[in-house]
């Protein structure tokens, strides 16, 4: 403020609790502060100083004041005193929290309320920050609330939510923070149709959103750095994973996009099954042995379990546990001029691999 | 306790046979694989055969066709039966329960194949 | 066929020493690796399968590592005992081939 020639200049800073007159102290000048409120309720203070500064404070937030200004000159009222009225700014809530909901992309916006009496309620916006396209919404409630949601927000886009105090037609200056909703991810992970070489993965995708697909990304557990993946469709929840290695672990994600946004993996774990051994060969024929022979799995084995029986045969075959180093078996004390029936199965503990048999006569 | 007595050793001249026994207890026989590994005089182990609980058979190369090796679940009792014998075939014969890894070896019996 | 070569052949050593026995595949054999131990006149023990897995009722101070084509065995305090030979067995494919042994003989 800069009123008449005679008074010194002076300025006036009003906040929420306080108002503040300011002035570049000289000799024999003083300036003395009365505030009393303009609908009484409160005492009125008066404060005298040559200081330089007089802080009224103990205001109550978003109250009309009335507060006079006099110059002192060697301590006596030489001016008329400057009378004004103002209204102290509403306090705005404080601790602020924001809350996004990645399953339902719902945001939570909650806060502590303004020590402001008798305000009208609260005012709250998202706007997207830094002009980026997207939603910009708005919610009041009323002064006794302290949180609201807001939803169809878009996810991975950064939001810049505010909360307002509001008193009739005045509000405070806004407690804001930024948050960046999240991608909901698909849920209930499960694996069917397990074989050597392929597995089906199926999921559920997030509710009330409408992704841009799903990232499936999968790679053998020891070996994680080899990651392979495929992007599927929004309208789909299931891929046929191939080319797999057998007897494998794999970890197996899968993540919601919208638009260039990805939502939190879900994982999962699994084994694909064993390969059979192939390549079954005959030799060293006799009339009561013959040599079996066959190429091992690329799965990781134990052993084998060789069951050979004559073809017509419905009595218990006989049975041999080999170690997984052997690809070859002698079968003795057959029965001469017989068709036998010779199959071969991959052991890992107790898991089995499909059979490989065989047939040949002595 | 696991205990594999071997026997049947001896000398032999080139050409002749000779049938070595294994003796088990402290285990059941029947569902084990069993192998005879051999040592000869100053020299590493060697590999000879294995038989499966089935009664399935592998051999080296070096016995092919001249040894067979067979098992008697009711006696307990493993069998290395060694024609054409060789000069080079001259070694202590150990029974090994389990093949791949040896963990219970006999003591052992000496063949000495010499005219 | 396999070959396992074990190195060094023989060494000395005293009591109290830390010993550590070589062999080397010829090619990779993964962790399918067996360490025997045999005393003269006596049968093979076994004393470590699967490269680094200890036989039930062996002393603690040996120890087996590596895999692929390189395994060593430790021994990490030599005791009177143990001197005799040793020999490194591979049983990831057929047939079983073993090194030619390493004779532990007191200095």
């Known amino acids: 403020l800069q009123p008449g020639s005679s008074i010194p200049p002076y300025n006036t800073e009003v906040t929420e609790t306080t108002i503040v007159i300011t002035w570049t102290p000289a000799p024999r000048i003083g300036f003395k502060l009365g505030v009393r409120p303009s609908q009484g309720g409160e005492a009125p203070r008066e404060v005298t100083s040559d200081s330089g500064s007089i802080v009224v404070s103990g205001l109550t937030p978003g109250v009309e004041y009335v507060y006079t200004i006099q110059v002192l000159r060697d301590g006596q009222e030489r001016d008329a005193p400057i009378v004004n009225k103002v209204v102290t700014p509403l306090s705005p809530p404080t601790n602020l929290h924001l809350e996004a909901n990645p399953d339902t992309g719902v945001l939570t916006v909650s806060w502590e309320r303004s020590t402001t009496p008798d305000i009208t309620g609260y005012r709250i916006t998202t706007t997207p920050t830094n002009g980026q396209q997207g939603n910009s919404l708005e919610e009041v409630v009323h002064a006794d609330q302290s949180s609201c949601t807001f939803d169809n927000l878009s996810p991975g886009l950064e939001y810049n939510v505010s909360v307002y105090t509001v008193k009739d037609d005045k509000e405070s200056v806004p407690i804001s923070d930024t948050i960046i909703p999240a991608v909901p991810p698909p849920t209930d992970l499960r694996f069917t149709n397990i074989g050597p070489d392929t597995m089906r993965v199926t999921w559920a995708p997030p509710p009330s959103i409408d992704l841009t697909n799903f990232l499936v990304r999968y790679s053998p557990v020891k070996n994680e750095e080899d990651v392979a993946e495929l992007s599927i469709s929004p309208s789909d929840n299931a891929v046929v994973l191939t080319n797999l290695l057998p007897g494998t672990e794999y970890v197996v994600s899968v993540s919601s996009v919208y638009e260039q946004h990805e939502s939190t993996p879900l994982r999962g774990r699994q084994k694909t099954g064993l390969d059979s051994p192939t390549g079954i060969d005959f030799s060293d024929i006799t009339a009561n042995s013959f040599t079996v022979h066959w190429i091992a799995p690329r799965a990781t084995i134990t052993g084998y379990r060789i069951r050979h029986h004559p073809e017509h045969f419905s009595g218990r075959p006989r049975e041999d546990r080999v170690p997984h180093s052997r690809n070859s078996i002698t079968l003795t004390n057959l029965t001469p001029g017989t068709e036998y029936v010779v199959s071969i199965v991959a052991l890992n503990g107790r898991e089995e691999s499909p059979l490989l048999i065989g047939q040949q006569s002595t | 306790e696991v205990q594999l007595l071997e026997s049947g050793g001896g000398l032999v001249q080139p050409g002749g046979s000779l049938r070595l026994s294994c003796a088990a207890s402290g285990f059941t026989f029947s569902s084990y694989a069993m192998s005879w590994v051999r040592q000869a005089p100053g020299k590493g182990l060697e590999w000879v055969s294995d038989i499966y609980d089935g009664g399935g058979t592998n051999y080296a190369d070096s016995v092919k066709g001249r040894f067979t090796t067979s098992r008697d679940n009711s006696k307990n009792t493993l069998y290395l039966q060694m024609n054409s014998l060789r000069a080079e075939d001259t070694a202590v014969y150990y029974c090994?329960?389990?093949?791949?890894?040896?963990?219970?070896w006999g003591q052992g019996t000496l063949v000495t194949v010499s005219s | 066929d396999i070959q396992m070569t074990q190195s060094p052949s023989s060494l000395s050593a005293s009591v109290g020493d830390r010993v550590t026995i070589t062999c080397r595949a010829s090619?990779?054999?993964?962790?399918?690796l067996n360490w025997y131990q045999q005393k003269p006149g006596k049968a093979p023990k076994l004393l470590i399968y699967?490269?680094?897995t200890l036989q039930s009722g062996v002393p603690s101070r040996f120890s087996g590592s590596g895999s692929g084509t390189d395994f060593t065995l430790t021994i990490s305090s030599l005791q009177p005992e143990d001197f005799a030979t040793y020999y490194c067995q591979q049983a990831n494919s057929a047939p079983t081939t073993f090194g030619q042994g390493t004779k532990v003989e007191i200095k």
């Open positions: 090994a329960k389990t093949a791949d890894n040896f963990d219970y």
């Open positions: 699967a490269a680094s």
């Open positions: 090619q990779s054999i993964s962790s399918y």
